[in-house]
Every structure is written in structure tokens, then in C-alpha cells.
């Protein structure tokens, strides 16, 4: 570690005196610069000497000497006071720049340590400090304003009491810069725009920043637009606003618009799309199939997507029949706006009844005209089965009628004994009717089919069962011949 002679740590001299500071180390040593021109610097073997023949108040400061070759990087320091009765302060810098919440060092150095008790910090021309200004003083370094605030960016003077009067330093300008957390905040409205050719349009790009040094521009595709900006200050932020006002839009105005703002922290951009159309439009679509099948008693939501410009002037859901003249309850119709030009309309149909099958139409209107989208709703029913004994052309015949949707298929079973329902162990014979006769098949209604089982003689100790099934479920009816005739019954529920 180098050593300074005289040993210090402080040296007090009068103006005009000769001062010699010698730094000695094991190897070569050097003084931390910059050294003012008033000093002469020369090397003397392993030592470095600073000397001045005419000390002035401006030589007041700390002088530090280091030994570059020292692995420990040690240094020695001495603080020189040149106590000038006329000049109590040596100001090392006239401007200090810090960020908010940093400590700001105002480097006015006292030229006479005896004056330390009577020092104070004031604003220019002796004005008092702002409230809540927290500061401390070090005779070697000056005044420190702790955790400086933006509002404390002012001109300051250091004051010392000399012979009962206050003597001021030259002024020091403190600039406190706001900490910029990131690029400016942006808004671009609207987020999306559609206009008919010839209509007016407006796009507003605005940016806000914690300080005034930032730029903002609006570009169309890649072209920066010549828009005069409007400036404002509110909510403790600087605002810059660009308003693009188009009196009569044309197709060349369509495209991507980007609002771009930048500051020292970087760039931020946001975009929107402007569509110019020849005329009003109204498009209805659904992600669902327009032909819907639902099991009776279940619920269904019918959903329609609408894209329209200009906005809708009217819309409604209508039941077109065929069963009743009821109309969907308004409370079951729901509208949600996805964005300015796209909407979703939902009709909720809970616990569907047979009379609610049929066509449901969504109608919408705007200046482009009327549009409709129609759903066809068919209800699914499990089969209902009945069997009767009849004679056809003199032959005894079992006649099975099955009704349901989708169309049921029919299977006949013969099984041993008298039973309400044939189980697999009892089955003696199975007949599948590949083409039962369709008795009725009306839209939105059950399909009724008929299957015949012709038998010359029905064995008394047997059960004959007609079974029908479709995708919803199954139904059956058992027939038991008895001596007096025949008896039929459905299985127990």
C-alpha cells in the first residue's frame, strides 16, 4: 500500500504557500487524475511528487495515490484545504445529473475545516430548500441530497458562516431525471375499422411517457404519416396524440396501421387493420351443422355468427313450425359482441319437447338488407313397440308396429316358456326383418315401421317378442299364445 507524505489525512495551508505531496510505494505509483495545471508532477525513483508554488482555494480537494502493480489494489489519500478567507467554497462541478431516488452529490468543498459547523444548503439566491429535502454534508465531498426527487432538480448554493455573515458558493444546477421504466405506453383506437368507400374515418394513436423526451408516429403499412401531434400533460405523464382524420376513405387507405413510440428504453408498437368495402355487408354463419338432431328432453344451443357493417338495425329468432305457433322466448336468446363488427347470437332450447322440433331461423338486418340462417331441428325418440295378432289372407300373423327416430330396425325372437322378455338363454329362434314396411315418415316426426311374422300355428308354451332399436334406445313387446286365443303385453318397465 502506498504512503503519502505529509501523513495527513488532512493538510491545511494558506493561499500562496508551496505544497508538496509525495507518494511512495514498493513499485511505481501514480496520482489519480485529473491533476489541475497549477500542479507540477514529477517522478523521483519509486515515488511520485505533486507540487505547487502558489496554492489557491481551487486546490482544495482529496488527492489519491495508487500503486498499479499492487495485487491488493491499495491506495492512500490526503485532503488538502487551502483556507482562503475570501473563498470558503471550491465548487468542482456546476452541473450534476442523477436519476430519481439516487443520492445527488453537490461537490462544493469547504476550503477551511473550521467553518463546517456553520454550513447549509440553499436554493439559488438564498431561497430555502423544498420541504422534505433530506441532505447531509461532508467537508471532503460536499452536500449530498439523499434519494433526490424530480422536483428537487433546481439550482443550489452552498452557504458558510464567516464572521457572522453567510458567504455563498457559485451555483450548482442539479438535474434529476425520471427513471424510465420502459418504452412509452401506447393506445391505438379503434382496434379494428371498417368503412364503406366515401365514408369518413378516424384513427387515433396516442403515447404517454414519464418524461417529455419520446417520439411517436403513425404509419400506414410501412409509410410514416405526416400527422401533426397534439401534446398534453396529465396523470403525471406526458401525452402525445396523433389523429388521422379521413374525410372520404378510398381503397388505398385500407391496410395495416401501426402506432409506434420510442424513448431511451426502446420502442413499442401496436397495430390495427382498416378495411374499406364497396358497400354494406351482412354475413351469417354457424360453426354448427344447420341440420341438428337432439334426443327429446335434452337441450340445445343454436349459435349464429354475424359479421356486419354498418351495425345491425334489427335481429330476431323465429320458429317456422311445423308444430305450433309458439315463438322462442326472448330470455332464451343471447347476444354477445366479439368485437365491433362480429357478433354471436345464441338461442338456448332447454329440455326439448316434441312440439319444439322444426325450423328455427335467425334473421338480421342492416343497411345492406336482410339475411337469414335456418336450422332444422329433428328430435330423436327411442322406439315404442306394439304387437297384435291378426289374420292376413287366412294366415295367422303377428303384426309389430315400431315408432321412433331415427328409424328403428326390427328383430323377432322366439323363446321357451311364458316370459315378459326373452333373455339370451331362452332364445330358440331369431328373425331379423331387413326391410320393415315404413308406415309414416314425416319431417321432424317419428318414423313408424311395421313388421309381420307369419305363423301357421303358434306353439302354446312359447313367447314371441318383437324388439326394435335405434341410436337412442330400444323397445320390445312380448306375445304369449293361450288356448283361448292370444295375449300380448309389453315388458315391465
Amino acid at each position: 500500500i502506498p504512503v503519502i507524505e505529509p501523513s495527513g489525512p488532512e493538510l491545511v495551508v494558506k493561499p500562496g504557500e508551496t505544497v508538496t505531496l509525495r507518494c511512495v510505494g514498493n513499485g511505481s505509483v501514480e496520482w489519480d487524475g485529473p491533476i489541475s495545471p497549477h500542479w507540477t508532477l514529477y517522478s523521483d525513483g519509486p515515488s511520485s511528487v505533486l507540487t505547487t508554488n502558489n496554492a489557491t482555494f481551487q486546490n482544495t480537494r482529496t488527492y489519491r495515490c495508487t500503486e498499479p502493480g499492487d495485487p491488493l489494489g491499495g491506495s492512500a489519500a490526503i485532503h488538502l484545504y487551502v483556507k482562503d478567507p475570501a473563498r470558503p467554497w471550491n465548487v468542482l462541478a456546476k452541473e450534476v445529473v442523477v436519476f430519481e431516488d439516487q443520492d445527488a452529490l453537490l461537490p462544493c468543498l469547504l476550503t477551511d475545516p473550521v467553518l463546517e459547523a456553520g454550513v447549509s444548503l440553499v436554493r439559488l439566491r438564498g431561497r430555502p430548500l423544498l420541504r422534505h429535502t433530506n441532505y447531509s454534508f461532508s467537508p471532503w465531498h460536499g452536500f449530498i441530497i439523499h434519494r433526490a426527487k424530480f422536483i428537487q432538480g433546481q439550482d443550489y448554493q452552498c452557504s458558510a458562516l464567516m464572521g457572522g455573515r453567510k458567504v455563498m458558493s457559485i451555483s450548482i444546477r442539479l438535474k434529476v431525471q425520471k427513471v424510465i421504466p420502459g418504452p412509452p405506453a401506447l393506445t391505438l383506437v379503434p382496434a379494428e375499422l371498417v368503412r364503406i368507400r366515401g365514408e369518413a374515418a378516424q384513427i387515433v394513436c396516442s403515447a404517454s411517457n414519464i418524461d417529455v423526451d419520446f417520439d411517436v408516429f403513425l404509419q400506414h403499412n410501412t409509410t410514416k404519416l405526416a400527422i401533426p401531434q397534439r401534446s398534453d400533460f396529465h396523470d403525471n405523464r406526458y401525452q402525445k396524440v396523433l389523429t388521422l382524420s379521413l374525410g372520404q376513405v378510398d381503397f388505398q387507405h385500407a391496410g395495416n396501421y401501426s402506432c409506434v413510440a420510442s424513448n431511451v428504453q426502446g420502442k413499442h408498437s401496436t397495430s390495427m387493420f382498416f378495411q374499406v368495402v364497396e358497400s354494406a355487408y351482412l354475413d351469417l354463419s354457424s360453426e354448427q351443422n344447420l341440420i341438428q338432431e337432439v334426443t327429446v328432453g335434452e337441450g340445445l344451443n343454436l349459435k349464429v355468427m354475424v359479421e356486419a357493417y354498418p351495425g345491425l338495425q334489427g335481429f330476431n329468432w323465429t320458429y317456422l313450425g311445423p308444430f305450433s305457433d309458439h315463438q322462442p322466448e326472448p330470455k332464451l336468446a343471447n347476444a354477445t359482441t366479439k368485437d365491433t363488427y362480429r357478433h354471436t347470437f345464441t338461442l338456448s332450447l332447454p329440455r326439448l319437447k316434441p312440439s319444439e322440433a322444426g325450423r328455427y331461423s335467425f334473421l338480421a338486418r342492416n343497411p345492406g338488407g336482410w339475411r337469414a340462417l335456418t336450422f332444422e331441428l329433428t328430435l330423436r325418440y327411442p322406439p315404442e313397440v306394439s304387437v297384435i295378432w291378426t289374420s292376413i289372407n287366412g294366415s295367422g300373423t303377428l303384426l309389430c308396429a315400431a315408432s321412433g327416430y331415427p328409424q328403428p330396425n326390427v328383430t323377432w325372437l322366439q323363446c321357451a316358456g311364458h316370459t315378459d322378455r326373452c333373455d339370451e338363454a331362452q332364445v330358440l329362434q331369431v328373425w331379423v326383418d331387413p326391410h320393415p314396411e315404413v308406415l309414416s315418415q314425416e319431417p321432424f316426426q317419428k318414423v313408424t315401421v311395421q313388421s309381420l311374422l307369419t305363423a301357421e300355428t303358434l306353439e302354446h308354451n312359447q313367447t314371441y317378442e318383437c324388439r326394435a332399436h335405434n341410436s337412442v334406445g330400444s323397445g320390445s313387446w312380448a306375445f304369449i299364445p293361450i288356448s283361448a286365443g292370444a295375449r300380448t303385453h309389453p315388458p315391465d318397465e
Epitope: 409509410t223 410514416k224 405526416a226 401533426p228 401531434q229 401534446s231 389523429t243 388521422l244 374525410g247
Partner: antibody
Framework: EVRLQQSGPELVKPGASVKISCKAS????????MHWVKQSPEKSLEWIGE????????TYNQKFTGKATLTVDKSSSTAYMQLTSLTSEDSAVYYC???????????WGAGTTVTVSS | DIVMTQSPSSLAMSVGQKVTMSCKSS????????????LAWYQQKPGQSPKLLVY???TRDSGVPDRFTGSGSGTDFTLTITSVQTEDLAVYYC?????????FGSGTKLEIQ
């Protein structure tokens, strides 16, 4: 209809000043930069400068700095140009012109003739 | 400043003829960001203020007859009138709006024979 209506001709003495006006109508005055152009037989068309009607901030052709001062009155949608220390070299037709968003002058005033003569 | 040079300074043509006039700039007017040339052409008829014909070197302004065509890129630009009409008697100016100060050419005077 978008229009820029300029004030009438001016006959002024050397050394004097003149202030000419340009009243905008048919559009949002603060939405576009206003520019001024000088036309003299010797020098063809010369760009003088522009003003942002929102803020009043100006950009001048260095040649006209100190000669021309641009101002606006937003309440009347009027732009002004003051010319000082006039000499015969300042005799010309002066146009105000609206700068379109796409960097061209889409609307021009009819021009104001300034004649400097003793 | 960018210097704009127009040629010829004047020309006399008959109705129906094709007219070509040139404009050269002392530095490129092609903006690398949007690949557009920041050059406009104006027509000034006697006693009138200038009227825009073409911007971005080749985009015809709405309402301008399609006999007027702008072309060129970088530093060399051309205005062509495919079939000149009597009402085309005017002075034609090119102007750069690439950087301030905006500058104009000295004009090409078109006379009809």
C-alpha cells in the same frame, strides 16, 4: 369542400413588415400541417416552412429563418405568416398549402401577392 | 439541401402528341423503410395555384386524367402525358418531400402549338 382562403394583395414599403393570413375550412384544421411556399419569377417555387397547428411548433427553411414567422389561431382555423424587414427580393406570390398525410400538398390557397416598393 | 433539376425548361407540342419531361434529384428520394419515392408532380396553369398530379413518383391523384403518368426511382423521374390536350398548357413542377427543406424543380413550361 376543403378550402384555404388567403388574404388580399399587399403593397408595402422596404423595411416594413407584412402579415398574411390563410383561413382553412372544410376539414379539421389541427389535423394537418400547414406549409408556406414562395413563388417569384426568378426563383420558381421555394419552401418557406411548416407549422403544427396543435402546438404552434415550426420548421423553417434556413434561408427564411429570421425573415418569416409562422403562427396559427386555432379558434378561427387560420394560419398566419409574418414577413419582416422587407426588400424588393421579397416581392412574390406567397401560398399556404396543406400537407397531406402522405407527404404532398393536396390543397393550395389562391396565393397572396406581396409587392415591396417605395 | 436536395437540388431538383428539371428539363427541358420549355417545350411546344401539338394536340395528341406524347410529352415527356424529366426531373433529377441530387440525392436519392427512395425511402428504404417503405420503398417509396418521395417525389410529387404539380401542374400550374396561368394565373392559378399549383395542383397535385402525382405523388410517390407514380401514384396518380384522384381525378387526374390517366394520360398523366409518373415514373422513375431513386434520382431520375419522368412525367409523361400520353396524348396532350389544349387544357394541359401549364408549367409542371417536381418536388421532393424526402427531407426538409422541401425543394422544387425550376419547372417545365408546356406550350401547345
Amino acid at each position: 369542400e376543403v378550402r384555404l382562403q388567403q388574404s388580399g394583395p399587399e403593397l408595402v414599403k422596404p423595411g416594413a413588415s407584412v402579415k398574411i393570413s390563410c383561413k382553412a375550412s372544410g376539414y379539421t384544421f389541427t389535423g394537418y400541417y400547414m406549409h408556406w411556399v414562395k413563388q417569384s419569377p426568378e426563383k420558381s417555387l421555394e419552401w418557406i416552412g411548416e407549422i403544427n397547428p396543435n402546438t404552434g411548433s415550426c420548421t423553417y427553411n434556413q434561408k427564411f429563418t429570421g425573415k418569416a414567422t409562422l403562427t396559427v389561431d386555432k379558434s378561427s382555423s387560420t394560419a398566419y405568416m409574418q414577413l419582416t424587414s422587407l426588400t424588393s427580393e421579397d416581392s412574390a406570390v406567397y401560398y399556404c398549402a396543406r400537407l397531406n398525410y402522405y407527404w404532398y400538398f393536396d390543397v393550395w390557397g389562391a396565393g397572396t401577392t406581396v409587392t415591396v416598393s417605395s | 439541401d436536395i437540388v431538383m433539376t428539371q428539363s427541358p425548361s420549355s417545350l411546344a407540342m401539338s394536340v395528341g402528341q406524347k410529352v415527356t419531361m424529366s426531373c433529377k434529384s441530387s440525392q436519392t428520394l427512395l425511402n428504404s423503410n417503405d420503398q417509396k419515392n418521395y417525389l410529387a408532380w404539380y401542374q400550374q396553369k396561368p394565373g392559378q395555384s399549383p395542383k397535385l398530379l402525382v405523388y410517390f413518383a407514380s401514384t396518380r391523384d384522384s381525378g387526374v386524367p390517366d394520360r398523366f403518368t409518373g415514373s422513375g426511382s431513386g434520382t431520375d423521374f419522368t412525367l409523361t402525358i400520353t396524348s396532350v390536350q389544349t387544357e394541359d398548357l401549364a408549367v409542371y413542377y417536381c418536388q421532393q418531400d424526402y427531407s426538409t427543406p422541401f425543394t422544387f424543380g425550376s419547372g417545365t413550361k408546356l406550350e401547345i402549338q
